[in-house]
């Protein structure tokens, strides 16, 4: 999906009002400097591409993020403020339903959410170019 035409300010507002708190809640108990920042993004569409990937694509050691509150709110924000996003996600959603639904907070998931916090932080930078 090409995130170029999203309403970035509306997504930023959704992040600041609710998604950020859910990320904080998920990370509760984690040490500040436990994980290095290794994932980056250069502009807002790129940041959303990386955020989508880390939030919804299962990775080795962390298959359970998509059912978390911050993930569901991220999905809702993208669906509302990114034209045509919902349609591209139908197949992905059906595939996800076939996976196990048990929530397990592994260290790998915490590391991944730490990277997500960094990506969202970059997305919210006031001077970050949109293209």
């Amino acid at each position: 999906y090409d995130f170029t035409n999203c309403d970035f300010e509306k997504i930023k507002a959704a992040y600041l009002s609710t998604i950020s708190k859910d990320l904080i809640t998920y990370m509760s108990g984690t040490k500040s400097t436990e994980f290095n920042n290794t994932v980056s993004c250069s502009n807002r569409p790129h940041c959303l591409t990386e955020i989508q990937s880390l939030t919804f694509n299962p990775t080795a050691g962390c298959a359970s993020l998509a059912k978390e509150m911050f993930a569901m709110k991220t999905k809702a924000a993208l669906a509302i403020w990114c034209p045509g996003y919902s349609e591209t996600q139908i197949n992905a959603t059906q595939a996800m339903k076939k996976r196990r639904k048990r929530k397990v907070t592994t260290n790998k998931c915490l590391e991944q959410v730490s990277q997500l916090q960094g990506l969202w932080r970059r997305f919210n930078r006031p001077l970050l170019k949109q293209q």
Epitope: S28, K31, S32, T33, F35, R125
Partner: antibody, heavy 118, light 107 residues
Framework: QVQLVQSGAEVKKPGASVKVSCKAS????????MHWVRQAPGQCLEWMGE????????DYNQNFRGRVTITVDMSASTAYMELSSLRSEDTAVYYC???????????WGQGTLVTVSS | DIQMTQSPSFLSASVGDRVTITCKAS??????VAWYQQKPGKAPKLLIY???MRHTGVPSRFSGSGSGTEFTLTISSLQPEDFATYYC?????????FGCGTKLEIK
Amino acid sequence: QVQLVQSGAEVKKPGASVKVSCKASGYTFTSYLMHWVRQAPGQCLEWMGEIDPSDSYTDYNQNFRGRVTITVDMSASTAYMELSSLRSEDTAVYYCALTGTINYFDYWGQGTLVTVSS
Amino acid sequence: DIQMTQSPSFLSASVGDRVTITCKASQDVVTAVAWYQQKPGKAPKLLIYWASMRHTGVPSRFSGSGSGTEFTLTISSLQPEDFATYYCQQYSSFTFTFGCGTKLEIK
């Protein structure tokens, strides 16, 4: 182990600028955010701003915007905080401090006293 | 910005006493609160993060609790080295803000 070593005390005249340094060691410099926090005599701790050394992006407390500039020298693993248009109420101890993506401060420099006096 | 209101500003107590310091946030900060101890001429030292997690090496007599807008730091049995100034800090929202401190003095 992580260490943050700051430059020595400074005495400045009102209207001048001061530049405080913070030399980091014991970790990969680009991995974490560097913050500056100040403490005026008998006052609260006040967060001034931060820098992401990986790309030198800065965020500042609105109270200091326009007067504070935070920079890094990657080759020296050193962060700098410059405060301009100094006034007597800027007399304070200035600390550098380190965080990851979660913004509480588990590592601090030893502090640098800046005195502004005519 | 979120305001962090700490009370009391000053507290006199004796060795062995149990003391409680409170911090109120002007809006919900979930559990994103840290507590620091500062002694004269020294940098603050992290005691508690995530409202209740003790930092490495911090004695078990220090404990934190709370969520939302009300938080407490408790020292169960004061030791001579505990007389210092204590600060709370919220890291839920940018800009990151501190309480104005509680100075704990020997009675």
